[in-house]
Interface confidence: low
């Protein structure tokens, strides 16, 4: 049986604090009471808390905890959100510049190939952008499509300018011949290797950053259990029931409670560490052919070299293709 | 000879900031991000301690609250909290993570695996697998890396000079970047702060 309160004891201080938390005084006893109905702030003596107050404290404690968690992760969340945005924007700029450089190369070296070349280049770089953002496109197909589309234009405009405007028939034959005869040498394969490697790495880098945001958002909005709410209430608010307004929890006690409340969250630690170290490893390797900036901004030059390669072998190619696509050409002249 | 197209696209506004002391490149920005992220490598294991240090905890006071009573800060009772006969802290830990945390752990495991498979093995940045047919003279050599940027005077000296400060200021309309402020219903009338 707890001892009765001293005759002059009141719950005035507790009431004035609780009023800030919950306007309306009806839940706070006038003077200390036995508190036999309390479930969390179990009294050793008379108490200034009621069951309703206890419930309110639990709710507030859990909200406090959620807010503390959010403020803890705010800087980290920003760091990743901001960088994900910056890199995505930067990659888009790189793609745009790479397209501009490639178009400029065509305009100034092979004006007869424009505007068709512009169209094919535009489609290629659109696919590049979509791939980086996660679209299900095959990089080899993208590169093949670029060269398949370019070759008929190169053949009819550069190698064989006497031909009338190319018709669908010869185009299809020329597209096939492009691969069979390895018209561009090893350049398409070279570009495939460079582009696919650099874009894969870029894509996974962006995916990783976006997952980082998801991880923080998940832990940022965790709802804490009732058990945790009770532990937090006992730590932060039960002292008020005894009129101990200025007392603070013991440090070691706080750590024990927090480890209990955050046991699940702390399990992420191992995988979070691994995530940062794996991301570092990826970033350390993002150079030369694994650096999309390097690869894409140099692409105009490789494409230029590939066209020069075709021109160098034009005589041999024209003869072979003349035979190979003769049927299509005859139908065209009719 | 190949046309050197750089001057076609230089924004005159960019020229004004051409002489930046520290020229920020994509790769330097990436490395900087990793360095900052590494300062958060212990983020999750440090959370309990962080939250205690950011909530009211007795630091200089002689007395502190152990959940049941007022005790001396360095006494045995301060470490032994008043949780006996309440509910078992061990039980709380044994429940395991919430489903949402388990899901995010699975996603992290998956991305970590992807990141590891994508990482370039040390000393193997160049692939020498272009063995289908020898290049003719004037083509690139075995090292596909030699071909980056092409050859001759057509080779553009791309040196990772994408300037963020110049580019993002002028190439992107900053005001058009979508905000992250989706409307969430504010907590109804709760004061979720501490009072001493």
């Amino acid at each position: 049986q707890p001892p009765p309160p001293p005759p002059d004891a009141t719950c005035h201080q507790v009431r004035s604090f609780f009023q800030r938390l919950q306007p309306g005084l009806k839940w706070v006893p006038e003077t200390p009471v036995p508190g036999s109905d309390l479930q969390v702030c179990l009294p050793k003596g008379p108490t200034c808390c009621s069951r309703k107050m206890e419930e309110k404290y639990q709710l507030t404690a859990r909200l406090n905890m959620e807010q503390l968690l959010q403020s803890a992760s705010m800087e980290l969340k920003f760091l990743i959100i901001q960088n994900a945005a910056v890199f995505q924007e930067a990659f888009e700029i790189v793609v745009r510049h790479a397209k501009n450089y490639t178009n400029a190369m065509f305009k100034n070296n092979y004006p007869s190939l424009t505007p068709q070349a512009f169209e094919f280049v535009g489609e290629f770089f659109t696919d590049v952008s979509l791939y980086i953002l996660g679209s299900d496109i095959n990089v080899d197909d993208m590169v093949n499509e670029l060269f398949d589309s370019l070759f008929p234009v190169i053949y009819t405009q550069l190698m064989n300018p006497g031909l009338p405007d190319s018709a669908l028939d010869i185009n299809e034959c020329l597209r096939g011949a492009r691969r069979d005869l390895k018209v561009f040498g090893n350049f398409p394969k070279l570009i495939m290797t460079q582009v696919s490697k650099s874009l894969q790495v870029t894509r996974i880098f962006l995916q990783a950053l976006n997952l980082g945001i998801e991880v923080i958002n998940t832990t940022d909005h965790l709802k804490f259990s009732k058990d945790c709410g009770r532990m937090l209430t006992r730590m932060w608010y039960c002292s008020y029931c005894q009129g101990l307004m200025m007392v603070k929890p013991c440090g070691g006690y706080c750590n024990v409670v927090m480890q209990g409340c955050m046991a699940g969250v702390v399990e992420i630690d191992k995988y979070w560490r691994e995530y940062i170290l794996s991301l570092e490893e990826l970033v350390n390797g993002m150079y030369r052919i694994y650096d999309m900036e390097n690869v894409l901004l140099g692409l105009f030059s490789t494409i230029h070299d590939s066209i020069q390669y075709v021109q160098k072998n034009a005589g041999k190619l024209t003869t072979t293709i003349g035979k190979l696509c003769a049927h299509s050409q005859q139908r065209q002249y009719r | 000879s190949a046309y050197y197209p750089e001057d076609l696209f230089i924004d005159k506004k960019v020229l004004k900031v051409a002489h930046v002391e520290h020229e920020e490149t994509l790769s330097s920005r990436r490395r900087e991000l990793i360095q900052k992220l590494k300062s958060f490598i212990s983020f999750y294991s440090a959370l309990p301690g962080y939250i205690c240090s950011h909530s009211p905890v007795a630091e200089n006071d002689t007395l502190c609250w152990n959940g049941q009573e007022l005790v001396e800060r360095y006494s045995q009772k301060a470490a032994r909290n008043g949780m006996k006969n309440q509910f078992n802290l061990h039980e709380l830990k044994m429940k395991g993570p919430e489903p949402v945390v388990s899901q995010i752990i699975d996603k992290l495991k998956h991305i970590n695996q992807l990141l590891r498979t994508m990482s370039v093995p040390k000393g193997r940045v160049l692939d020498k697998n272009l063995d289908e047919e020898g290049f003719e003279s004037g083509d690139c050599g075995d090292d596909e890396d030699e071909c980056i940027g092409g050859s001759g005077d057509g080779m553009m000296k791309v040196k990772n000079q994408l300037r963020f400060l110049a580019e993002l200021a002028y190439d992107l309309d900053v005001d058009d970047v979508p905000g992250n402020n989706q409307q969430a219903t504010p907590k109804d009338n709760e004061i979720s702060t501490f009072h001493n």
Epitope: A72, E75, Q82, A85, V86 | S39, A46, D175, V177
Partner: nanobody, 123 residues
Framework: QVQLVESGGGLVRPGGSLRVSCAAS????????MAWYRQAPGEQRESVAA???????IYIDAVQGRFTMSRDNAKNTVYLQMNNLKPEDTAVYYC?????????????????WGQGTQVTVSS
């Protein structure tokens, strides 16, 4: 010398609005993620909102949907538009960079704290 000057606070009724400003001198804040913090009497200083260099902003749940943070790089100033104010928003509001926070430290150097601007919400 770096200086941050907050202004625009005042007394407002619940449900009212205020716009507080933070003007910086001695530093170009366009390269910083900037944040607004507040401190009510006897309480910890807490972060309220922050805005990245690209103009993206985030908020703590308690103010989400009511507060909007923005920046004007030309004026080297950040703003916090506060609508539907509640008594619990009463505090001194400060701005600072959000770039130098480190986990485990209660306060951080950042750009140095200004004097803050008092916001009181009361009927």
């Amino acid at each position: 010398q770096v200086q941050l000057v907050e202004s625009g606070g005042g007394l407002v009724r619940p449900g009212g609005s205020l716009r507080v400003s933070c003007a910086a001198s001695g530093v170009d804040i366009s390269t910083y993620t900037m944040a607004w913090y507040r401190q009510a009497p006897g309480e910890q200083r807490e972060s309220v909102a922050a805005i990245s260099t690209t103009g993206r902003s985030i908020y703590i749940d308690a103010v989400q949907g009511r507060f909007t943070m923005s920046r004007d790089n030309a004026k080297n100033t950040v703003y916090l538009q506060m609508n539907n104010l509640k008594p619990e928003d009463t505090a001194v509001y400060y701005c600072n960079s959000a770039d130098d926070l480190k986990i485990g430290t209660q306060y951080f150097k950042g750009l140095g704290w200004g004097q803050g601007t008092q916001v009181t919400v009361s009927s």
